[in-house]
Interface confidence: low
């Protein structure tokens, strides 16, 4: 008689789990001269602790302690690039402007991205059937916690000038309720960050409106600046060009407004 | 201990085809990137193509795309590569070797080479 | 035409130390990693040196790597007859998408 489960309505476990967190872990320490001392072993047991034989509605930060020790890594603090609803591009704007760097190009960003996960209360199985959604569920699964977790971090950590890509073809181009707009924006440390500058990208080719007036961006602009926190905004009429200028600036072609 | 064995080679006619096949043993084959490299005679060692670990990306060096294709079954431990439309330029020894762990690509050396099988074409 | 550029040739007498250059460029060298191999006459090629400067377990410590910039090295330290051979750097080409070669340095023994 199969054993009962418990029934989540978000997707579960990604397949082989373990081993591509295990095998990120060891790209990534290959790839990061200043990572190489990460033992990966201990990153996945610490990883794999935070979750198994808990129950995935009813973790916290505490449980992933162990795994921001392990992983804790120094980026430039004023080369931070936060995003919301357009991770694809902010990656592929990393990738080339390589001194800049999302969440997603830090270790544990790193092992995570685009990966679900979750255990069972008391037995030390990973779930592969379901895990709990974050709404339908519960906000204390696995996945929202380590997220939650790992952005507070990131923006502590932030200095300087702090840039935010935003998506103009979102109805809600700030969500607060987004991973940026409920723990990213709160946790700018304002004794350490001078500005942030949101870049909001446009989708349409012809779209020449100043999307940086949306009411969801001078929502964005007050919340900022109860924080003392200056605010600047950028319209990027057309992201195709915007790379392309990140890798070649010297065209002549990028000397137009993009 | 880590074996690559690769078979396949020998001689063929120029515009005929091949296909090799490098049986690995001694480690998990699924957790690897696999690549071909091959050695002309009397020359230095050339990059053919890389397979990562799912198969799900592939790459060859520009003078053999498009007749090439590499290719594996993670089932049987086999690293396989179709050769169609062979040139006399390319007569050389064809090594199978093992990459990083996971097809790094970054970090990309191969840590393990089987012997190597002679691929001649020649009317 | 090898895109990594190495001397074709090194020589040394027993004990010397032989140093082999391995030229590249942005897109290889130097944002990859380097690796070094040697092959013996007639076998396959053997790992040296991996991630710029690594010794796999086994390769004596008088073979020692190391990087700067767009080119890297390879030193060999107190010279032995068995060191006569080929030997290769190679790395990783992100513009090309695939790996990429020296064309081999021989060493001989002198």
């Known amino acids: 008689v199969p054993r009962w489960r418990q029934q989540w309505s978000g997707p579960g476990t990604t397949k082989r789990f373990p081993e591509t967190v295990l095998a990120r872990c060891v790209k990534y320490t290959e790839i990061h001269p200043e990572m190489r001392h990460v033992d990966c072993q201990s990153v996945w047991d610490a990883f794999k602790g935070a979750f198994i034989s808990k129950h995935p509605c009813n973790i916290t930060e505490e449980d992933y302690q162990p795994l921001m020790k392990l992983g804790t890594q120094t980026v430039p603090c004023n080369k931070i690039l936060l995003w919301s609803r357009i991770k694809d591009l902010a990656h592929q704007f990393t990738q080339v402007q390589r001194d800049m760097f999302t969440l997603e190009d830090t270790l544990l960003g790193y092992l995570a991205d685009d990966l679900t996960w979750c255990g069972e209360f008391n037995t030390s199985k990973i779930n592969y059937q379901s895990c709990p959604d974050w709404r339908k569920d519960c906000s204390n699964n696995p996945v929202s916690v380590f997220w939650k977790t790992v952005s507070r971090r990131f923006a502590e950590a932030a200095c300087d000038v702090v840039h935010v890509m935003l998506n103009g073809s979102r109805s809600k181009i700030f969500d607060k309720n987004s991973t940026f707009g409920s723990v990213e924006v709160h946790n700018l440390q304002p004794e350490k960050v001078q500005t942030l500058e949101a870049w909001v990208i446009h989708g349409g080719r012809e779209d020449s409106r100043d999307l940086c007036q949306d009411p969801t961006i001078k929502e964005l602009e007050s919340i900022i600046s109860k924080r003392n926190i200056q605010f600047s905004c950028k319209n990027i009429y057309r992201p195709d060009k915007f790379l392309q200028c990140v890798k070649n600036p010297e065209d002549s072609s990028c000397t137009s407004e993009i | 201990e880590v074996q690559l064995l690769e078979s396949g080679g020998g001689l063929v006619q120029p515009g005929g085809s091949l296909r090799l096949s490098c049986a690995a043993s001694?480690?998990?084959?699924?957790?690897?990137?696999m690549s071909w490299v091959r050695q002309a005679p009397g020359k230095g060692l050339e990059w053919v193509s890389d397979?990562?670990?799912?198969?799900?990306?592939?790459h060859y060096v520009d003078s053999v795309k498009g007749q090439f294709t590499i290719s594996r079954d993670n089932s049987k431990n086999t690293l396989y590569l179709q050769m169609n439309s062979l040139r006399a330029e390319d007569t050389a020894v064809y090594y199978c070797?093992?990459?990083?762990?996971?097809?790094?690509?970054?970090?990309?050396?191969?840590?393990?080479w089987g012997q190597g099988t002679l691929v001649t074409v020649s009317s | 035409q090898s895109v990594l550029t190495q001397p074709p040739s090194a020589s040394g007498t027993p004990g010397q130390r032989v140093t082999i250059s391995c030229s590249g460029s942005?897109?290889?060298?130097?944002?990859?990693?380097v690796s070094w191999y040697q092959q013996l006459p007639g076998t396959a090629p053997k790992l040296l040196i991996y991630?710029?400067?690594q010794r796999p377990s086994g390769v004596p410590d008088r073979f020692s790597g190391s990087k700067s910039g767009t080119s890297a090295s390879l030193a060999i330290s107190g010279l032995r007859s068995e060191d006569e051979a080929d030997y290769y750097c190679?790395?990783?080409?992100?513009?090309?998408?695939?790996?990429?070669f020296g064309g081999g340095t021989k060493v001989e023994i002198k």
């Open positions: 397979i990562s670990w799912n198969g799900g990306k592939t």
């Open positions: 942005s897109s290889n060298i130097g944002d990859n990693y």
């Open positions: 001694g480690f998990t084959f699924d957790d690897y990137g």
């Open positions: 991630r710029d400067s």
């Open positions: 070797a093992r990459g990083s762990l996971f097809h790094d690509s970054s970090g990309f050396y191969f840590g393990h």
């Open positions: 190679q790395s990783y080409d992100s513009s090309l998408s695939g790996s990429v």
